[in-house]
């Protein structure tokens, strides 16, 4: 019997201080350019080595963010979101949805923390 | 398997052009950043041309300006360079590199070397 895959949705307040090289992340999304099917949704694609973001440590690849300094992120096409992030600030305040994977064992196994998978 | 594939290039006289291209396969490119880079012979790799994923702004190194055109297809899944009025100093080697996503960083100097994941194995471009 194949196990089933879960998700466990977390939602964070993230505080970065724009770097040197900036914010230090790229982004996926929008109601032009779905990542991710039947979601309009900004999404992280890619964290900057040494950047603020990788310095700070918890904003991760796969991360949907929802707002930026209380400005909600739907129904924005692509490269608005881009501007926005771009002349957000030097103090920028996201809050994110994170989304572990979980592997669930088949029903009956005891195994939910099981982070395999 | 990720793969980017140049071609295009050869052997052209000063004042001629070229038209390179850089075909992706096993991804999508509608979601990636993508540019031109070329090394010359005992000389650093550099960025010479990039677009980001929407096709809605590009770079452009001060050396090319007014000559060289970069391009995106998504439904070809290709990207070009179009390369006018050749001179010398443009013999290099020409790659595509992608990135996914584009940056919420300023400055179009976005076409770093160090911003992109994924690289092809280039096109010798030869003017003489």
């Known amino acids: 019997m194949n196990g089933r895959v879960d998700y466990l949705v977390t939602e964070e307040e993230i505080n970065l201080t724009r770097g040197p090289s900036g914010l230090g992340f790229n982004i996926v999304g929008g109601t032009d350019q779905q990542y991710v099917s039947n979601d309009s949704g900004i999404y992280v694609s890619r964290i900057k080595e040494n950047g603020a973001a990788a310095l700070d440590g918890r904003l991760q690849e796969g991360d949907k963010i929802l707002s930026v300094n209380g400005q909600d992120l739907k129904n924005l096409l692509h490269q608005d979101a881009v501007d926005l992030f771009r002349n957000a600030g030097y103090a920028v305040s996201l809050r994110v949805q994170h989304r572990l994977q979980v592997q669930n064992g088949p029903i009956g196994h005891r195994g939910e923390g099981d982070p395999s998978g | 398997e990720v793969q980017l594939v140049e071609s295009g290039g050869g052997l052209v006289q000063a004042g001629g052009s070229l038209r390179l291209s850089c075909a992706a396969s096993?991804?999508?490119?509608?979601?990636?950043?993508i540019g031109w880079f070329r090394q010359a012979p005992g000389k650093e790799r550099e960025g010479v041309s990039c677009i980001d994923s929407s096709g809605g702004s590009t770079f452009y190194a001060d050396s090319v300006k007014g000559r060289f055109t970069i391009s995106r297809d998504n439904a070809k899944n290709t990207l070009y360079l179009q390369m006018n009025s050749l001179k010398p100093e443009d013999t290099a080697v020409y790659y595509c590199a992608a990135v996914l996503g584009d940056s919420v960083d300023y400055g179009m100097g976005y076409c770093n070397l160090d911003e992109y994941d994924y690289w092809g194995q280039g096109t010798q471009v030869t003017v003489s």
């Open positions: 096993g991804f999508t490119l509608d979601y990636y950043g």
